[in-house]
Interface confidence: medium
Amino acid sequence: EICGPGIDIRNDYQQLKRLENCTVIEGYLHILLISKAEDYRSYRFPKLTVITEYLLLFRVAGLESLGDLFPNLTVIRGWKLFYNYALVIFEMTNLKDIGLYNLRNITRGAIRIEKNADLCYLSTVDWSLILDAVSNNYIVGNKPPKECGDLCPGTMEEKPMCEKTTINNEYNYRCWTTNRCQKMCPSTCGKRACTENNECCHPECLGSCSAPDNDTACVACRHYYYAGVCVPACPPNTYRFEGWRCVDRDFCANILSAESSDSEGFVIHDGECMQECPSGFIRNGSQSMYCIPCEGPCPKVCEEEKKTKTIDSVTSAQMLQGCTIFKGNLLINIRRGNNIASELENFMGLIEVVTGYVKIRHSHALVSLSFLKNLRLILGEEQLEGNYSFYVLDNQNLQQLWDWDHRNLTIKAGKMYFAFNPKLCVSEIYRMEEVTGTKGRQSKGDINTRNNGERASCESDVLHFTSTTTSKNRIIITWHRYRPPDYRDLISFTVYYKEAPFKNVTEYDGQDACGSNSWNMVDVDLPPNKDVEPGILLHGLKPWTQYAVYVKAVTLTMVENDHIRGAKSEILYIRTNASVPSIPLDVLSASNSSSQLIVKWNPPSLPNGNLSYYIVRWQRQPQDGYLYRHNYCSKDKIPIRKYADGTIDIEEVTENPKTEVCGGEKGPCCACPKTEAEKQAEKEEAEYRKVFENFLHNSIFVPRPE
């Protein structure tokens, strides 16, 4: 039986009975928040072989192993993930081992096993046999390995039953529990699965099979399942569904949406049966099962019941996400906020049309209006008193309206009003008059030339770069020395730089008045010698990366005809030199015959240039006889199992401090103090843990039904 669309078992362990007849869970499986320790021995679900999404276990008291519950769980497909993970085991207080001894494949996603105070047999599982890449796995805060004394079957009797693999240069036996080995297929099978008797399965099988080389005997399918057969692609007139099986049109038409009774039914798009048209597509009929592309972003009209929508926080802006036409008036009043410019762009950046007026007042957090990056029409159907449809009042840090070289904005009806915007140059306002077609509509007092731009460098001269030199992680630039009318008014220069993959950045991108700024800033003092051109060495840059750079002169607030003079450069785009790439990731090797090795890897995370080829080197190594002489009984006495507290053992997260030879004598030194990079990595690690935990809690704690 296929169960779904996701099973959530919480509070009462007897709900597990819902899994009784499931062979495949089409969706996720949550088992969580069972606070009373129960005896799970009577619960066993041998039919369950596949979970198409993810498995999440959280705070289930009394459960000591998953092996008895799910003895035949073979594949977790990870079609949809829980925060990038296909298997999450979190805060399972009594879990002693995972024990999923038939788990052979996690098709997509990583694993997260964290804060399980009594959990052992983690170092004995070779996850690389189950997952394609193990680099994203997160296994921390469990019982420290040295307190576990994990023994694989037969090792105490010197008759080891399990096979060995190498993990982190440690060649050891692989098992799930004290009596269950980790299954490995013969190298002759390559990437194929195998039967219990080590015969190779059909290439379309995944995980395991009941008979060799037979596409109807698979436990799970590598690609798709259709009419009892594993197939590489869905046959004609059938459609991919939930990432694992093929269904016909009638099946797709008959699915009731689990998520919304308002759904108009599933659609067929690009060979797949799905709940809704994907982003950028729209149904071609209310009864239609087919999608057609939208022209541009799919239009969405949003309307405010009270006619005027006040944007005074990110939360209020969030209501406008995806809107392309706003029916009503926008009142923007952003006094403070964190990373406000990019948040506003995220939520309001698709708005193209406002049917009423736009009013921006007391928005001291705004430096630019570029977050309304698609606004092209203000209809002015409703206007403020005085017939204003664009009104900008008292915004202490507003410096730019839009980048008028790349912006067409029309104000169909109504006038503009600007007052008390001390950093907004009048020339910027005049430019807006021309672009928007409002020139001639405003009366004299509508654009105040005394209190707009009174604290800005409005009459800007252009600074010219004179030289640029690059290396793999440095850029040296110099520019002409700026000479204002009175040399004493020049204080210093500020260099702004940031990564810019495309040549489309503006000075105000991601910038707000509350400290958020996507630009890095460096102050440059004036060279003491008046004939030396100012310059700077930017270091710590990434190789083979394009940067945008511009320079501003910092001048005294010297008033000349009501305004301050200043200077800045155009934005310069410059790429650092290529460098040696970082190491290739996830290197795997397997032998498929007595004379061949297959080596597979993923590209480096930092190519640092255009990769043109890889160099593969290999050498023959003598067999290590020690491996055969190793005797488990000669190990140090296995430590008594102390109950761990589930907090994270620093040793697990960071490697043990290395002892080094000091001076001429052999003796251990103290561990070196942590570098800034290590401290930063630890900080990020802690932050990442918090983010995940918040995500987990937000996802699973829901209000009780009424």
Partner: antibody, heavy 117, light 107 residues
Framework: QIQLQQPGAELVKPGASVKLSCKAP????????MHWVRQAPGQGLEWMGE????????NYAQKFQGRVTLTVDTSTSTAYMELSSLRSEDTAVYYC??????????WGQGTLVTVSS | DIQMNQSPSSLSASLGDTITITCRAS??????LSWYQQKPGKAPKLLIY???NLHTGVPSRFSGSGSGTDFTLTISSLQPEDFATYYC?????????FGGGTKLEIK
Amino acid sequence: QIQLQQPGAELVKPGASVKLSCKAPGYTFTSYWMHWVRQAPGQGLEWMGETNPSNSVTNYAQKFQGRVTLTVDTSTSTAYMELSSLRSEDTAVYYCTIGRGRGFAYWGQGTLVTVSS
Amino acid sequence: DIQMNQSPSSLSASLGDTITITCRASQNINFWLSWYQQKPGKAPKLLIYKASNLHTGVPSRFSGSGSGTDFTLTISSLQPEDFATYYCLQGQSYPYTFGGGTKLEIK
């Protein structure tokens, strides 16, 4: 509250055309298909066609194909239905209505079109 | 076109009664059936959509069931405001088609 506003009545001559409006404030106009249904005096309900305000895709009942045209103006959240070559049997109340789960959730109050010379 | 056969065409009942109206489709329409109530001179009102989902604001004495070709609307404990004409509508394939209607009258 979603409400669809339609004019009360239209009197037209046979052979002429009529263009009915349906103003749709109070909801995201482009999020729902707009349908047109008519009801002749003392008769049942008859579906004429639908349009998607977000991309102007239309689907018509075969019976009205060629005679009916559905359009929208998203800036004013108004849908229009134009019926041409009118005959006396087109005398009916014409409703605009928006969809929900392939049903018609909200209805205008209807426009009575009388075709008479 | 899919034909919708609604029965009975008229029905008399008393306050507090439970009544059932049926709608039969000429072919499988899955669960794409909705029910409407119309009073004289007024626009129809949606009661049930997708065969069994109660529309917002509709009293719980209205219920719908069925799938495939046979569907029923049940009104339990009839109230004075329930006396009206009821229509079913199929949304499985174009064109949308209505049943002929059932006029519910007070006995």
